[in-house]
């Protein structure tokens, strides 16, 4: 198959490779305080860390990218750490007609990979 | 809505922001010459370039990431340029039972965004 085996152990040392990390943010940080009422603080899971060769490759394209980056680092960037899935979050916010609860499916990362 | 308007004009100058670029690669480059027979050369579209604030944001999460990167650049990375969609590619390759044509859906990028 076109898939080499993606690596799951980090060759750079603990916590250095692509992983999920929690970042605390207030509505003010996000610039949402004028329209979101609740929650006032968000625990935002984000994808951080490096993507060494074949670490958590998202797909065949990411494996190719990793290989070509090794050959042409100035021309082809290394894969980077982005969400592979998301966790839904419900926000309470102002609308034209009052106040509403709405679920956002693409706000908080649940998993990460190298793409 | 949680979506600020993603920017589509590059503030860094032409060709600097996240875009699709063609990279020529041989089967040797990819390490595939022992099992792929054709094509011998691939025109690989890849996503390259920077992701300045709100440029081609993939979703709400990417917009949040851009904003928090501005506030905490050491803790939160900037969004990065990754494929938003792929173009299928047919490879002719050796199998245990002979030669086969197989479609790969995740090999060549068709569009890019900042995630």
């Amino acid at each position: 198959s076109a898939h080499a085996h993606p690596r799951d152990s980090c060759p750079l040392g603990p916590g250095r490779c692509c992983h999920l990390e929690t970042v605390q943010a207030t509505l003010e940080d996000l610039g949402w305080s004028d329209w979101v009422l609740s929650p006032r603080q968000l625990q935002l899971s984000m994808c951080v860390g490096e993507c060494p060769h074949l670490y958590r490759s998202a797909n065949t394209h990411a494996q190719i990218k990793a290989r070509l980056h090794g050959l042409q680092p100035d021309k082809v960037p290394a894969p980077c750490c982005v969400p592979s899935s998301y966790t839904p979050v419900v926000l309470m916010h102002r609308t034209d007609s009052g106040v509403s609860l709405q679920t956002y499916d693409d706000l908080v990362a649940r998993g990460c990979h190298c793409a | 809505s949680a979506h600020a308007h993603p920017r589509d004009s590059c503030p860094l100058g032409p060709g600097r922001c996240c875009h699709l670029e063609t990279v020529q690669a041989t089967l040797e480059d990819l390490g595939w010459s022992d099992w792929v027979l054709s094509p011998r050369q691939l025109q690989l579209s890849m996503c390259v370039g920077e992701c300045p604030h709100l440029y081609r944001s993939a979703n709400t999460h990417a917009q949040i990431k851009a904003r928090l990167h501005g506030l905490q650049p050491d803790k939160v990375p900037a969004p990065c340029c990754v494929p938003s969609s792929y173009t299928p590619v047919v490879l002719m390759h050796r199998t245990d039972s002979g030669v086969s044509l197989q479609t790969y859906d995740d090999l060549v990028a068709r569009g890019c965004h900042c995630a």
């Epitope: 009422l37 899971s45 419900v90 309470m92 609860l101 | -």
Partner: antibody
Framework: QVQLVQSGAEVKKPGASVKVSCKAS????????IIWVRQAPGQGLEWMGW????????VYAQKLQGRVTMTTDTSTSTAYMELRSLRSDDTAVYYC??????????????WGQGTLVTVSS | DIQMTQSPSSVSASVGDRVTITCRAS??????LAWYQQKPGKAPKLLIY???SLQSGVPSRFSGSGSGTDFTLTISSLQPEDFATYYC?????????FGGGTKVEIK
Amino acid sequence: QVQLVQSGAEVKKPGASVKVSCKASGYTFASYDIIWVRQAPGQGLEWMGWISALSGDTVYAQKLQGRVTMTTDTSTSTAYMELRSLRSDDTAVYYCARTRHDTSGIRFDYWGQGTLVTVSS
Amino acid sequence: DIQMTQSPSSVSASVGDRVTITCRASQGIDSWLAWYQQKPGKAPKLLIYAASSLQSGVPSRFSGSGSGTDFTLTISSLQPEDFATYYCQQVHSFPITFGGGTKVEIK
């Protein structure tokens, strides 16, 4: 520890108003919103509305719109629910509850002991 | 409004029994569902939130599952203090709505 203490039982005549208080302690009042829920004798739970303790924004159940007003006083960490033009079917135990809302979702984690409001001529 | 339908409306069980209560939403509510326990003359007590997260201090014999429209509360081994009425509640959209309740009685 977190506590919500409600005002005492009330007996009201039809057409009158009632104002129930809910005094919070053991946490930062403005950091958590308050909901009100009522329960008629032998019946289930009915959500009445939500108030933001920080901004004062409110959401009311449609059937109570125009008769109910929810307010907060952050200086005394107290929430109030006033119901006007009382009818016999407003006879119920009225509860306040603290809203916990984060990225895991919404839940009502601490409740007052309840206030019985009886509407009778 | 989202209607929440609980079943059964009552169940007779013995100490040690496994009890399952179901709750169905009239439209999809993701995982935005909570379960509460209420004893006579007392305020409701939160057991489960976000469909399956156990509230702090609640015994692990209580568990919740489901997403979308169908949800379940399970008491793995009924204890004497578990005889009460249980309510599901959706917090997906306003107005917030409760199920009609399930009374767990001693057999």
